[in-house]
């Protein structure tokens, strides 16, 4: 029976993934009962990705390592729609690391997953980035401009946002 073997495979995958993320929240994609897309609980989902707001305060490097051990990366923001989704889950009085850095201090910004940096799809606050020694990017809220990006020193502990592709089972 096709449906039985599909269910057995799905349960096997769930067991395999359980040691890394004990609970997954899954939805059926489209009309096809075959395709379940999942995010770890309590991550949120948008389009094909899962997001986790890490409230522990860590340096940029430690924040990225924290994401990577969960199978994710610091968030790479590709569209305005994605940013608009993400900010719904952020606190206005906090700042959050993005997966964006300028390791050489030469204003060669690079995303942690090697996505090409596109100047046309950036959401820097006005006047930012403004310091060659501030080599990591955060997203934060400014009353005059709402949510946007700012460059800061990488060693200064911040909250962070992790992103991973949805898990398909």
């Amino acid at each position: 029976n096709f449906m039985y073997s599909k269910t057995v495979k799905r349960l096997s995958k769930l067991r395999e993934y359980q040691q890394y993320h004990p609970s997954l929240t899954c939805v059926m994609e489209g009309k096809d009962i075959e395709d379940w897309s999942c995010c770890p609980t309590p991550w949120t989902s948008f389009q094909s990705s899962c997001y986790f707001i890490s409230t522990g305060m860590q340096s940029w490097t430690k924040s990225q390592k924290n994401c990577s051990v969960m199978g994710a990366d610091l968030v790479v923001i590709n569209t305005r729609e994605e940013q608009d989704f993400i900010i719904q889950n952020l606190k206005r009085n906090s700042s959050y690391f993005l997966g964006l850095s300028d390791p050489g201090g030469r204003r060669h910004w690079q995303w942690v997953d090697q996505t090409p940096y596109n100047e046309n799809v950036t959401f820097w606050h006005s006047g930012e980035p403004n310091n060659l020694d501030e080599r990591c990017a955060i997203i934060n809220f400014r009353s005059s401009e709402e949510w946007g990006w700012n460059d800061i020193h990488c060693h200064v502990p911040q909250k962070s946002i992790c992103k991973m592709k949805k898990i398909y089972i």
Epitope: E16, Y17, Q19, S68, G71, V112, D113, M164, K165
Partner: nanobody, 127 residues
Framework: QVQLQESGGGLVQAGDSLRLSCAAS????????MGWFRQAPGKEREFVAA????????DYRDSVKGRFTISRDNDLNAGYLQMNSLKPEDTAVYYC????????????????????WGQGTQVTVSS
């Protein structure tokens, strides 16, 4: 927690071949994507090759394409880098790295995407 150990490095002549191995322990190897990176004296560590956790997807830095081949054996908990037609500029310490992933098809090329690293193995290519 994952532990990694590289082997297979050595001193060879330009044009020769080497096969590097990376033995993994401590977790389910098939849940991890693998990458090889290298660091030449006085230079930054750079991406060499990457392979997805299923082995179905690979990626290479331009300068090694056609000469290097990355592979893995999930049953043996091991990854490999076959290096042919070696050049003096391939001289470096070679590191293998792993990252947890739930995608079977993604090969990760970013150094910071890998939290688990081996100690490295020296490859020296003389002219």
């Amino acid at each position: 927690q994952v532990q990694l150990q590289e082997s297979g490095g050595g001193l060879v002549q330009a044009g020769d071949s080497l096969r590097l191995s990376c033995a993994a322990s401590g977790d389910t190897f098939s849940m991890y994507a693998m990458g090889w990176f290298r660091q030449a004296p006085g230079k930054e560590r750079e991406f060499v090759a990457a392979i997805s956790r299923s082995g179905g997807s690979t990626d290479y830095r331009d300068s090694v394409k056609g000469r290097f081949t990355i592979s893995r054996d999930n049953d043996l908990n091991a990854g490999y880098l076959q290096m042919n037609s070696l050049k003096p500029e391939d001289t470096a310490v070679y590191y293998c790295a792993l990252r947890l992933t739930f995608s079977t098809t993604t090969a990760y090329t970013g150094e910071l995407q890998y939290p688990y690293w081996g100690q490295g193995t020296q490859v020296t290519v003389s002219s």
